[in-house]
């Protein structure tokens, strides 16, 4: 905290300019009018203030706006944003996407800080949903943003926003998140033709149910092994050898290299060895010929 002292004669700041870098902290406190600072915040960013000097400028704004800064000031905070605490940011009402972009730019290239997380949370809550433009902006700055949300939060994403999602945005999503996103993606891309549809839906297939995988197997999609390995095990298990062969197309040969890993391993255990042999890949572990397969889960459902 800087002590209150009178501004020396002739040092009262008439505008925010580079001459202020020569002021000591107490002089900044005494000689810079907070209202002037608020109206000329955009100039602060072009002046190489020390971090200590920035602390003084922040303190002046805090005194002027104890209930939280107005958006006109927030938009021009620049570096000063890095001085804000999550508690400061919770007082803000940020509604403009331009303001959000300006502040994310300051943190660009760094991990998502608690300040940024709080800012995004405030912004999204203020909008009521994660619309396409917001999602576009957030994933541009933080590709992993979508996968940092809980399934409950993801449920507020409208299907139209899914168009903004790139494959790399889903890299760190877990099955629970993909379970929420997949139906939205299916709805968003429903009017696309077969091959185009598959290109768009591919990244979301970790949330696809068995019946959708069966449908895809009829469309010559040639799913790659990396995508297949991310499918839900429970969705893959009911697929027949013929369906998997059609689903993977020329990539079916890759099953051999993955036969010890889920979901391939579990799927092999559910197939007749006879059927697996038709692939000619030497896959082992299927149900031996002559064995009767009882689907106990079906039996329980009937009784």
């Amino acid at each position: 905290e800087v002590e209150k002292t009178a501004c020396p004669s002739g040092k009262k700041a008439r505008e925010i300019d580079e001459s202020l870098i020569f002021y000591k902290k107490w002089e900044l406190e005494a000689c810079v009018d907070a209202a002037l600072l608020a109206t000329q915040m955009d100039r602060v960013n072009a002046i190489p203030f020390t971090y200590e000097q920035l602390d003084v400028l922040k303190h002046k704004l805090d005194e002027l706006y104890p209930q939280g800064y107005p958006e006109s000031v927030i938009q021009h905070l620049g570096y000063l944003f890095l001085k804000m605490s999550p508690e400061d940011i919770r007082k803000w009402n940020v509604t403009s996407l331009e303001t959000l972009k300006a502040l994310l730019e300051v943190n660009k290239g760094h991990e998502m800080s608690p300040q940024v997380a709080t800012l995004i949370d405030r912004f999204v809550k203020g909008r009521g949903q994660l619309d396409k433009d917001t999602l576009d902006t957030l994933t541009a700055f933080y590709p992993g943003y979508l996968c940092s949300l809980s399934p409950e939060e993801l449920s507020s994403v409208p299907p139209s926003s899914i168009w903004a999602v790139r494959p790399q945005d889903l890299d760190t999503c877990d099955p629970r998140q993909l379970d929420v996103l997949y139906p939205k993606a299916r709805l968003a891309f429903q009017n696309m033709n077969g091959s185009e549809y598959f290109v768009k839906i591919q990244s979301f297939l970790g949330g696809a149910p068995t019946e959708d995988l069966k449908a895809l197997s009829q469309q010559n999609v040639s799913m790659d092994l990396a995508t297949f390995m991310k499918l839900r095990t429970d969705a893959v298990l009911p697929l027949t050898v013929a369906e998997v062969q059609k689903l993977l197309g020329p990539h079916v040969e890759g099953l051999k290299a993955e036969e010890r890993h889920r979901p391939v391993r579990d799927w092999i255990l559910r197939q007749r060895q006879d059927d697996l042999d038709t692939l000619g890949l030497g896959l082992q572990g299927g149900i031996p010929n002559g064995y009767l397969v009882l689907d106990l889960s079906m039996q329980e459902a009937l009784s």
Epitope: N45, A46, Y79, V106
Partner: nanobody, 118 residues
Framework: LQLVESGGGLVQPGGALRLSCAAS????????IGWFRQAPGKEREGVSY????????NYADSVKGRFTISRDNAKNTVYLQMNSLKPEDTGVYSC????????????WGQGTSVTVSS
């Protein structure tokens, strides 16, 4: 992405030194540069400033007429020529860059030590 200062050292009162502030990993063209110094136990203070174009310079009262700031954008470097040095000029000198595209970047150097003593 960083700023690296050099040129500091031990010099006698009345002597001269030329400090350099070089940018590595980014171009200084769009950045305003400030030179600061910090003496042991004292607050860091601004010494000199140069605008991104080089058209505007400014100095602390204590160094006016003795220090000159300049920039060579082709060499991605800003210089501080210090003449008629005094013992009170002793301290760690560091440079800072502010501005850049969209005015959203800032960089600080680690500093170079200047000692003025007989």
């Amino acid at each position: 992405l960083q700023l690296v200062e050099s040129g500091g050292g031990l010099v006698q009162p009345g002597g001269a030194l030329r400090l350099s502030c070089a940018a590595s990993g980014f171009t200084l063209d769009y950045y305003a540069i400030g030179w600061f110094r910090q003496a042991p136990g004292k607050e860091r203070e601004g010494v000199s400033y140069i605008s991104s174009s080089g058209g505007s310079t400014n100095y602390a009262d204590s160094v006016k007429g003795r220090f000159t700031i300049s920039r060579d954008n082709a060499k991605n470097t800003v210089y501080l020529q210090m003449n008629s040095l005094k013992p009170e000029d002793t301290g760690v000198y560091s440079c800072a860059a502010a501005g850049g595209y969209g005015n959203s970047s800032r960089y600080w150097g680690q500093g170079t030590s200047v000692t003025v003593s007989s």
